[in-house]
Amino acid sequence: MSSKYPRSVRRCLPLWALTLEAALILLFYFFTHYDASLEDQKGLVASYQVGQDLTVMAAIGLGFLTSSFRRHSWSSVAFNLFMLALGVQWAILLDGFLSQFPSGKVVITLFSIRLATMSALSVLISVDAVLGKVNLAQLVVMVLVEVTALGNLRMVISNIFNTDYHMNMMHIYVFAAYFGLSVAWCLPKPLPEGTEDKDQTATIPSLSAMLGALFLWMFWPSFNSALLRSPIERKNAVFNTYYAVAVSVVTAISGSSLAHPQGKISKTYVHSAVLAGGVAVGTSCHLIPSPWLAMVLGLVAGLISVGGAKYLPGCCNRVLGIPHSSIMGYNFSLLGLLGEIIYIVLLVLDTVGAGNGMIGFQVLLSIGELSLAIVIALMSGLLTGLLLNLKIWKAPHEAKYFDDQVFWKFPHLAVGF
């Protein structure tokens, strides 16, 4: 007989989610208003298009990328949408409270929605490590804690290090990856006998995951350039991201074949490695002066991604309980670090070129920023993991991991799949 949604969660989730939504509506009512300044139509459309690109990345790209499980594809896509919708609302309020609140009201602009979508993207990257092992009520908690932690991290970095929006947001890769991995580490790990097949990928869900990867691949230049301050910076960022992701696709497919004894291409490797270049150049996408450098970074990132996908899943499955196909967490943790290291290397080269020890201070500041991002990610991730382990959330039993039927109504199925 098909498994019903647990009664306790049926009581808890709607009440918890709708109460939270009501609270958000009240906060929006009392503390926000729309930007009253008259925008020109052309500028409005251009600004909206960037936001739209980011929403497509989040809803379709990351939504489908995480949908490769044989029996958890519906939940992956829909839960991602749920988290995105909730995350954007909370991120708009939080960003407003942290940056504008002394003025008494939070002014909502298209840019605030853009920032909020990027903040919510962080949750969608992290959640890949825990999808299938948590219910919606737990995901609500994860959204609230992660968006709050990222918002505060960005504010602290902005105030202490005086970094711009772009540099501030580019810690998202490292932050999201380490947050997700630390949450996964706290959750029950062993998959009971008889459920191993559920965390395997299937052809149609894998195809939809590839679709997600394609959407992310197409729009990654928009993500990396969205927060830069001038047209020339944005243009360079778009070019460099495009070259990097183009090369990482070629590297991913050929590297995947190279890594297999029979020369076969792994779908899982390709899903994540195609994005490798975009993550690796993220921090310094506007600083790279020529295509060949961006392409070299794309190549290195692709190789690291394929290498990671080959050797890390065993360790991640054992230590963190992350299934083989959920490779986004450790992939982004490696590539995010690579991106940050590339930026620090550029600063080091400046130091060497100038022969000025004081520039070394900037290197230390950048290392400080990165360390702060990792520490806050790990601490808030562990806190979230501990919260998710509370009995109040009625987490799915280990035997029900990676099972759509726990959460969805399938009228055509009288019995299990």
Epitope: D40, S47, F111, T163, L227, S230, I232, L287, D350, Q362
Partner: antibody, heavy 129, light 107 residues
Framework: QVQLVESGGGVVQPGRSLRLSCAAS????????MHWVRQAPGKGLEWVAF????????YYADSVKGRFTISRDNSKNTLSLQMNSLRAEDTAVYYC??????????????????????WGQGTTVTVSS | DIQLTQSPSSLSASVGDRVTITCRAS??????LNWYKQRPGKAPKLLIY???TLQSGVPSRFSGSGSGTDFALTISSLQAEDFATYYC?????????FGQGTKVEIT
Amino acid sequence: QVQLVESGGGVVQPGRSLRLSCAASGFTFSSYGMHWVRQAPGKGLEWVAFISYDGSNKYYADSVKGRFTISRDNSKNTLSLQMNSLRAEDTAVYYCAKEHGYYRSSWYRNYYYYGMDVWGQGTTVTVSS
Amino acid sequence: DIQLTQSPSSLSASVGDRVTITCRASQSISSYLNWYKQRPGKAPKLLIYAASTLQSGVPSRFSGSGSGTDFALTISSLQAEDFATYYCQQTYSTLWTFGQGTKVEIT
């Protein structure tokens, strides 16, 4: 020729609000970041706020954060500064300035340099009870 | 915030003199430094950006040097119209700051 003309200054009581405007002409306004800079009587220059070419990025000096709001209307070639909760120390001549961008490359990285190459004549704001 | 300290605060010189004004940053700002000139009752004017690049239309007697924390503006042969207040400005961080100014007066 390239020109910036500020308006909206005047005498205002502490705690009240004022809105400054800056009309731009002679250049493609929508392609450039813009700044507000002020100068208190007998004092030096103080940077106040910046807005990027498309209005997305905004930065404020700590002394005005949460009280002042910079905005722009690219269809009308105007820059604005909404000043709320004014204090006596906000008394100054307020200048709007166009951002000048320049970039050069070494073999391994780009460098973006910015300055303010065109300034308005300034508008005086006096906060006094 | 990055503080800029100019020295001297004021100086007296004659037409034809060579004058150097220095600007020191509280932390390294690479070459992200501009110099402005302001005459009484007038708006400032950009002279030099990126520490040493002369803005178009600015006479070649003005030159800038330095990187990291120590910078200098040099006027090789002072002219009557150069008697003004000079400001340095950093654009390294998102919060731009100016030096307190150096007033160049006629002896």
